[in-house]
């Protein structure tokens, strides 16, 4: 159990890191292509991983203006990096009732990033609320 919970923790720490990357991108929102992207909100329970993959698949792009292009592209690439697999993620993959990415409301980059951050925070909240006390090293 311990190693599986440590794996879960490591996974959630990765989610924690993604929040910081989203925050970083929010600083450069004016340098992103002002395209409308599917942005899940109020995601139903057990569809979090499905919604997460929708955020990762979205075509967030740098507008290629100014000297922020490199940091934006690196940040977007890191957001799209596949997280290590978990039991929770695997279980949710079998749920066929989650909305398709295209069914979610499309939003410009600013709102897209805000909703992505909200989902990540919700996932961390669920993880930390569902386990016994003790830190990521316990």
């Amino acid at each position: 159990h311990k190693s599986s919970s440590q794996g879960q923790d490591r996974h959630m720490i990765r989610m924690r890191q993604l929040i910081d990357i989203v925050d970083q991108l929010k600083n450069y929102v004016n340098d992103l292509v002002p395209e409308f992207l599917p942005a899940p909100e109020d995601v139903e329970t057990n569809c979090e991983w499905s919604a997460f993959s929708c955020f990762q698949k979205a075509q967030l792009k740098s507008a290629n203006t100014g000297n922020n292009e490199r940091i934006i592209n690196v940040s977007i690439k890191k957001l799209k990096r596949k997280p290590p697999s978990t039991n929770a993620g695997r279980r949710q993959k079998h749920r066929l009732t989650c909305p398709s990415c295209d069914s979610y409301e499309k939003k410009p980059p600013k709102e897209f990033l805000e909703r992505f951050k909200s989902l990540l925070q919700k996932m961390i909240h669920q993880h930390l609320s569902s386990r016994t006390h003790g830190s990521e090293d316990s």
Epitope: D9, R10, I13, R16
Partner: antibody, heavy 116, light 107 residues
Amino acid sequence: QVQLVQSGAEVKKPGASVKVSCKASGYTFTDYWMHWVRQAPGQGLEWMGTIDPSDQYTIYSQNFKGRVTMTRDTSTSTVYMELSSLRSEDTAVYYCARYGFAMDYWGQGTLVTVSS
Amino acid sequence: DIQLTQSPSSLSASVGDRVTITCRASQDISNFLNWYQQKPGKAVKLLIYYTSRLHSGVPSRFSGSGSGTDYTLTISSLQPEDFATYFCQQGHTLPRTFGGGTKVEIK
């Protein structure tokens, strides 16, 4: 057990640069981001930025942008924080801190004194 | 940036006392609030993360609570080794910010 060991105290002249190191042990170095925080004498804690040791991705506080550079050496599990164009207000203790869900382990601190 | 206002800035207490320190954020930080202990010449220690989660090895006399913008650190029965400075820190939004600190002194 997790340990972060920082380099020793430094005395620098205004305008110079300082490079502080932080050697990590007791965990997988590339799994956790490392943050840098400083504390001026008698003051509170001030966040400077963070580095992802897996790929050297960095996020810097606007207060230090252009003056701070964070790097890492995976072969020695060490992160570095370099601060340039030093001024007297940069006199402080500089800390590295591993970030999981919080800054869960901290280095012992490195005192940097900027004086002419 | 999110401002964190800690109160009181200092307090005097005796061994065995119940001590409460508060931290107020300038906006909702959704429980992403951590507490640290600092002693002179020692490494900073994490006590509590995500409002109420006790870090490994931290005695159970330390507890945290709160939500939205208001958070509290409680030491149920102050011990001699607890005389130190305590900081709150928000992990909700970059840049990371800290409270101004609360120094707990011996009465």
